[in-house]
């Protein structure tokens, strides 16, 4: 994306097709891709699984991964709702965003810090990312303490979402 | 929105007007709608009210609701700042996002878990949603513990915001 | 940005160039500006500094500030990861978003509320804003307790990001 200094005397998208309207139009940032997936009902490993019957447009879902189909700059956001039965020690909740199996960003929060065995403690954790992604890039989420993600009480609260901000034609 | 496999040999927005430029242009995702509202000064019920003199464009505000005027995929985000005078027991803060009066997503966090009556405890809670919304859809926010939203000390911190990501013409 | 009532009988962007395609096209909201910066390794003051080798497009970075180059409606989001060695009293973590050296929005959270000197407590804090910004507007972040931002353990976790949602030509 090149950003014009003036909308009146330069082509909108580089190159030399400033008067060729179809050319300009086809190179304009019209593409839209997005996803909004809720966590799967039954979690059994640290890599979270998602309900593939969520919102998916221009993105694929496969084996716990969102798979990019169109290159560009994506806004990625994940939000998780935890319910912790406090043990006698504090608990560190961690949310990892992985791009192509590499940790790209993580968020941590400590709960049960008083060391008291309370009935339960709620905690909400979010993580976002703005990044260029290529075709076939995978996005996944890792939670070491996945047993604290209460998918039965909060089936709608644990989500992974992305949208394409700017395509890279 | 259909996403072309190649920007060079397909129309940008479906149909059969690929060489009819005005047709293509008018079907392109140009529409923009957004809102950014701060919480009202005086809260007296669990359904939050908002200052209608905030940013509103292509969205209406009525009786605590944002009302959609253009159909499409919206990004919705709410952030609340709590100030809790800790009682002797823990307090669960909850933020509910409602679409057409139905709970679509909620976030919960427990504060004052130590059971100690401290002077005050700050907590910040966010919630987001990416969803298709039709014309006249209402968006509202419910907070059971609205008395802990300190609108006087933090008048700017409690906000509800949306923007249209992709219109559905 | 004016939002058309019907995509079939009005120009997309006001004025009277509805059949003049190049005119329409050049006034369409194509501009894209964005930034995604990670916090600098060594922090020595409350105003945070950022790694200028992050993602910057249509935005400048200077002396701890993001500087707007194109006017419009921006989505701004900051996320910080704290690691606190609890003292004997509670700690209020605060994140301030400043626009042109004025406080625009803040987020606060209290940690170490039990008053116990635990080994460490993790906390994650986010803040967002949707606002119209003019050319040369500065965006900065202030954290009074910057010593708790652990840039060595979490070099990727502390970020300031913006994107232009709608330009105001």
């Amino acid at each position: 994306d090149s950003i014009p200094n003036s909308p009146d005397n330069v082509p909108l998208k580089g190159g030399d097709c400033s008067e060729d309207l179809l050319c300009i139009l086809k190179r304009a940032p019209f593409k839209k891709s997005w996803a909004y997936l809720q966590v799967a009902k039954h979690l059994d490993k640290t890599k979270l699984s998602w309900n593939k019957d969520g919102i998916l447009h221009g993105v694929r879902y496969q084996d716990g991964n969102l798979v990019i189909q169109f290159p560009g700059l994506y806004f990625i956001i994940c939000q998780l709702q935890f319910l912790v039965q406090c043990p006698q020690n504090s608990v560190d909740l961690k949310l990892e965003l992985l791009i192509n199996k590499h940790i790209k960003k993580q968020a941590l929060v400590t709960v049960c810090e008083s060391g008291m065995q309370t009935k339960h403690v709620y905690q909400n954790l979010s993580q976002f990312l703005l990044d260029y992604l290529q075709v076939d890039t995978t996005i996944s989420v890792n939670v070491d303490t996945f047993q604290y993600i209460d998918t039965s009480t909060f089936p709608l609260e644990n989500v992974l979402s992305i949208f394409l901000y700017s395509n890279s034609d | 929105d259909s996403i072309p496999n190649s920007p060079d040999n397909v129309p940008l927005k479906g149909g059969d007007c690929s060489e009819d430029l005005l047709c293509i242009l008018k079907r392109a995702p140009f529409k923009k709608s957004w809102a950014y509202l701060q919480v009202a000064k005086h809260l007296d019920k669990t359904k939050l009210s908002w200052n209608k003199d905030g940013i509103l464009h292509g969205v209406r505000y009525q009786d605590g609701n944002l009302v959609i005027q253009f159909p499409g995929l919206y990004f919705i985000i709410c952030q609340l700042q709590f100030l809790v005078q800790c009682p002797q027991n823990s307090v669960d803060l909850k933020l509910e996002l409602l679409i057409n009066k139905h709970i679509k997503k909620q976030a919960l966090v427990t504060v004052c878990e130590s059971g100690m009556q401290t002077k005050h405890v700050y907590q910040n809670l966010s919630q987001f949603l990416l969803d298709y919304l039709q014309v006249d859809t209402t968006i509202s926010v419910n907070v059971d513990t609205f008395q802990y939203i300190d609108t006087s000390t933090f008048p700017l911190e409690n906000v509800l915001s949306i923007f249209l990501y992709s219109n559905s013409d | 940005d004016s939002i058309p009532n019907s995509p079939d009988n009005v120009p997309l962007k006001g004025g009277d160039c509805s059949e003049d395609l190049l005119c329409i096209l050049k006034r369409a909201p194509f501009k894209k500006s964005w930034a995604y910066l990670q916090v600098a390794k060594h922090l020595d003051k409350t105003k945070l500094s950022w790694n200028k080798d992050g993602i910057l497009h249509g935005v400048r970075y200077q002396d701890g500030n993001l500087v707007i180059q194109f006017p419009g409606l921006y989505f701004i989001i900051c996320q910080l990861q704290f690691l606190v060695q609890c003292p004997q009293n509670s700690v209020d973590l605060k994140l301030e978003l400043l626009i042109n050296k004025h406080i625009k929005k803040q987020a606060l959270v209290t940690v170490c509320e039990s008053g116990m000197q635990t080994k460490h407590v993790y906390q994650n804090l986010s803040q967002f804003l949707l606002d119209y910004l003019q050319v040369d507007t500065t965006i900065s972040v202030n954290v009074d307790t910057f010593q708790y931002i652990d840039t060595s353990t979490f070099p990727l976790e502390n970020v300031l990001s913006i994107f232009l949602y709608s330009n105001s030509d």
């Epitope: - | 100030l83 005078q85 000390t153 933090f154 700017l156 | 105003k47 050296k101 406080i103």
Partner: antibody
């Protein structure tokens, strides 16, 4: 027109607690920060701290361990307690109003209303 | 928090302009545009004359103006008059949600 009046003992013994009250008349105590500022004889102003009607306080770091402020909205009063005083705490103590408005951003209008000040001497 | 730095005294003749500087740090004046100035006559309570760097409360003469650059704020008094003789204090909001004052400047009108 809002007026502020400080009250409290003019003499306090070392190691004891200094207690002052400020009464707000002619206006509401709500929606403002209420501040204490002191000035030793012949010296400059020192900001002690402030309290909002919600009970939130901010204190000068150098005095924080000794300062407590409170507000009583029903009486339109706010108060200052300074513990373990020494001769260095001898000063004229002013109560004052700070106006902060949150609109499109936070506007800080400064300390716009002051009491006339009360002299406190710390001596045995 | 350290006090802001002001010159102990300045002087000027009637009709002249004088400027009083106030130097802080990157955690107060350098961070926010929340600088206030106060005028204090002998045995009187201070009076607010400038807020948010360069704004005057109603009733304050246009001859008072403020500015801010980097970690330093300035108060300028133009068309100096005898009644301007007083002590002047700057104050800045700080990153810890507190305020800090300058040491004060005695203005003498010659």
């Amino acid at each position: 027109q809002v007026q502020l009046q400080e009250s409290g003992p003019g003499l306090v013994k070392p190691s004891e607690t200094l207690s002052l009250t400020c009464t707000v008349s002619g206006g509401s105590i709500s929606s403002y920060y209420w501040t204490w500022i002191r000035q030793p004889a012949g010296k400059g102003l020192e900001w002690i701290g402030r309290i909002y009607t919600s009970g939130i306080t901010n204190y000068n770091p150098s005095l924080k361990s000794r300062v407590t402020m409170s507000v009583d909205t029903s009486k339109n009063q706010f108060s200052l307690k300074l513990s373990s005083v020494t001769a260095a705490d001898t000063a004229v103590y002013y109560c004052a109003r700070e106006r902060v408005v949150g609109a499109s951003r936070y506007y800080y209008y400064g300390v716009d209303v002051w009491g006339q000040g009360t002299t406190v001497t710390v001596s045995s | 928090q350290s006090a802001l730095t002001q010159p102990a005294s300045v002087s000027g003749s009637p009709g002249q302009s004088i400027t009083i500087s106030c130097t802080g740090t990157s955690s107060d004046i350098g961070l926010y545009d929340y600088v206030s100035w106060y005028q204090q006559h002998p045995d009187r309570a201070p009076k607010l004359i400038i807020f948010e760097v360069n704004n005057r409360p109603s009733g304050v003469s246009y001859r008072f103006s403020g500015s801010n650059s980097g970690n330093t704020a300035s108060l300028t008094i133009s068309g100096l008059q005898a009644e301007d003789e007083a002590d002047y204090y700057c104050s800045s909001y700080t990153s810890s949600s507190t305020w800090v004052f300058g040491g004060g400047t005695k203005l003498t009108v010659l």
